[in-house]
Every structure is written in structure tokens, then in C-alpha cells.
């Protein structure tokens, strides 16, 4: 297979792509032009990075959830004292229930007042937002395009300043030499066009229909 790819690199016109229906074949076909000069990140490496990023994201989410739980616990411990029942009997517990019910009623009143204020604020915000739209005139939001993000950028976004300290991904990657010829670059470009044409539902549809 490697020999075939080197022959193809020497010929002026690349051979037409064979009709393949299995995704594993597509993968093999996609890697063929790079048998000699490997892509910057291999598929397995990409998968490894994705897995790593997902793990980091998962850890971050778990840490945040843990922090929230801790915060809730701290808030509750300051608001709710532990029940001290030693030496207290039926009479005191009955009275304690009365005291706690009174406290609950008070908190409920406060919550109701706060909710009323929040509702009022939300209404005011909605009114002001509407006024802003009216003043600006109607406008259309630009359609958002998908942006390709490098592994480094993704790590930077996830970890912020810690990205460089925790993992220097580039250290794990093979450096690509810059001695590529124009011809090779052009062929690589053609190959990429082929893959782009095949990617997406339309490309797959054409491939399967042929």
C-alpha cells in the first residue's frame, strides 16, 4: 500500500478514487496520500486528544459540582443549626417545633417578598429590552459559522492559564519538516478537496449512489 502511494505521488495525475462503501476503507483512503509525509495530527492522536479534553472537561464539571455541593453545605450549616436534643423532653420539642414553624413562616414571607421583587425586576428588564429594540430598529443576528479550533486553543479555553503548566501538547507531537515542495502541497490540497467533497451528507450520498 505504501509503494502504491509513492508511485501515485510521482505520477502527474492521481488515479481516480476506487468506489468504497465501508467507513474503514474511507479512512484508509484518506491516509493514503500521506503515507510518506504524515499529517500534523494522526486520527488516533486526534481521538486521544479529544478523549483527553473530554476527561478534563468532565473533571472540571465534577469539581464545579463538588464546589457547589460544598457551598450548599456551608450555607445550610450557617442557616440550620444541628438539633440539640440531649436533655430536652416532649415539652421542649413541642415548643421547638413551634419556634421552627415560626422561623419557616418568616423565611417564607421573606422568600415571597424577594420573589415579588425578582418578578418586578424581570418585567422591568423585559420592558427596557423591548425599548432598546424599538430604538435600534429591527436587526437580524448574524448566522454563526462553525470555527475550527486547534487542540491548543481548546486546551487554553478549557484550562485557561493552567494549560501550559499542566500539558504541553506540542511536546507529544512529531514536528513536520517545512521542506514540502509546491507540487506536493498542491497534491495535498487536491486530496483535501476530494475529502471535503466526500465529507458531509451530500458527499456520502454521492459516494453511496455511485
Amino acid at each position: 500500500m505504501a509503494d502504491g502511494s509513492s508511485d501515485a505521488a510521482r505520477e502527474p495525475r492521481p488515479a481516480p478514487a476506487p468506489i468504497r462503501r465501508r467507513s474503514s476503507n474511507y479512512r484508509a483512503y484518506a491516509t493514503e496520500p500521506h503515507a510518506k509525509k504524515k499529517s500534523k495530527i494522526s486520527a488516533s492522536r486526534k481521538l486521544q486528544l479529544k478523549t483527553l479534553l473530554l476527561q478534563i472537561a468532565k473533571q472540571e464539571l465534577e469539581r464545579e459540582a463538588e464546589e457547589r455541593r460544598g457551598e450548599k453545605g456551608r450555607a445550610l450549616s450557617t442557616r440550620c443549626q444541628p438539633l440539640e436534643l440531649a436533655g430536652l423532653g416532649f415539652a421542649e420539642l413541642q415548643d421547638l417545633c413551634r419556634q421552627l414553624h415560626a422561623r419557616v413562616d418568616k423565611v417564607d414571607e421573606e422568600r415571597y417578598d424577594i420573589e415579588a421583587k425578582v418578578t418586578k425586576n424581570i418585567t422591568e428588564i423585559a420592558d427596557l429590552t423591548q425599548k432598546i429594540f424599538d430604538l435600534r430598529g429591527k436587526f437580524k443576528r448574524p448566522t454563526l459559522r462553525r470555527v475550527r479550533i486547534s487542540a491548543d486553543a481548546m486546551m487554553q479555553a478549557l484550562l485557561g492559564a493552567r494549560a501550559k503548566e499542566s500539558l504541553d501538547l506540542r511536546a507529544h507531537l512529531k514536528q513536520v519538516k517545512k521542506e514540502d515542495t509546491e507540487k506536493e502541497n498542491r497534491e495535498v490540497g487536491d486530496w483535501r478537496k476530494n475529502i471535503d467533497a466526500l465529507s458531509g451528507m451530500e458527499g456520502r450520498k454521492k459516494k453511496f449512489e455511485s
Epitope: 443549626q81 430536652l88 416532649f90 421542649e92 420539642l93 413541642q94 421547638l96
Partner: antibody
Framework: EVQMVESGGGLLKPGGSLKLSCAAS????????MSWVRQTPEKRLEWVAT????????YYPDSVKGRFTISRDNAKNTLYLQMLSLRSEDTAMYYC??????????????WGQGSSVTVSS | DIQMTQTSSSLSASLGDRVTISCRAS??????LNWYQQKPDGTIKLLIY???RIHSGVSSRFSGSGSGTDYSLTISNLEQEDIATYFC????????TFDTGTKLELK
Amino acid sequence: EVQMVESGGGLLKPGGSLKLSCAASGFTYSNYAMSWVRQTPEKRLEWVATISSGGSYSYYPDSVKGRFTISRDNAKNTLYLQMLSLRSEDTAMYYCARRDNYFGSSFMDYWGQGSSVTVSS
Amino acid sequence: DIQMTQTSSSLSASLGDRVTISCRASQEITNYLNWYQQKPDGTIKLLIYYTSRIHSGVSSRFSGSGSGTDYSLTISNLEQEDIATYFCQQGHTIPLTFDTGTKLELK
């Protein structure tokens, strides 16, 4: 031996304030609720206040609510009763007592010797 | 508030007698009743709790009984050291209340 010693009593005028103390010993103080009970000159016993073991909850009869405050210092094994706006009817012997309970029935199982408070103009 | 009342404020008895002191609550207190003894020097001791349970260190000559609203303290074979004032106290509802006491005297 379980022991309670009250102090801080005295003679004062109506409207005055006073703070009684009760030093407890012979038991794990922080494990028990505590109470103050007074005995009037007519020898009637009146419950005045109760505080939970950790000091979070306190209980009072209407006659002293808002004027008296029970508190405790578990590090010092000491119980306190802060009395404000004293009236002549507050004249009594004030006893400090340890609380315990059995199947919901609470009782004062050990009492101090008492501290005398006289409110008179 | 629950009112506690004793049938008599004082009682005379002879040494060796069996003495019964009664106490009534103004409403049901479901056995949440305690008995205290106050000696002439002012010291107060718990005798009986939860109607019939004898407190540690208290002589078995003391016993308690009752239910609902009516309760009693019995001293069998009265001794000199039993000469004191006896109080009942309900532990059912706050405020905790005592009766006026029954003073036990020798005949």
C-alpha cells in the same frame, strides 16, 4: 459528683439588671440541657428558662420572655441568666439545674444551692 | 398553661407511717410527671421522674404512680430524713409548671 454553684445574686431596684452565673462540675456539661428555676418568697417553684446542650435553643415562660436571657459557655462549664428590667415579682431564690429526659419526659435531676435576688425600691 | 394542684398544702404523719401525696393536672399530661423533695435547708432533689421511675440514689421507700391527670407519691415507712416539702412538676407542655408543694410534718 455532679455539682452546680450559683453566684451573682443581690439586692437591686426595680428596672435594674443582673447577671447570674452557675459553675457546673462532675459531668460532661456540653452534653446536657440546663435550666433556671426560681422559688418565690411564698415558696412557689417557677421554671424560668431552659437552654439546649449546645446553646442553640432556649425556652422561657411568658412572664420573663424578652427580659431574661439564658446562655452558656461550654468551654467554661458555666450557665448564665441575664436579667433586665427587673420587677419586684422577680424577687426569689434562683436555682440552676441540670436537665435530663426519659422517653420524652424531661426533668431537673441535679440542682444547685441557689442564689438570692431581691428587687425592692 | 397547665395548672398543677395538690390536695393538701401540709400533711402530718408519724415515723414508720405510709404517706401518700396527691397531685392533679388541669389536663392530660401522659405520665410526664416528676416529684422533687426540698429539705428545710433549701436543697432540692429529684425523687421520681416519668410518674414512677426512681432517680438514682433515692431510697426505694419512695414510689410513684398515676396516669392521665391524677398522680401520687407514696413514702412507705416514713423516716426522720423524709421530713421536707414535696413538689410535683409536669413536663408535658411549656411552660413547665410546679404545684404549690406539700409540707410533710411529724405528728
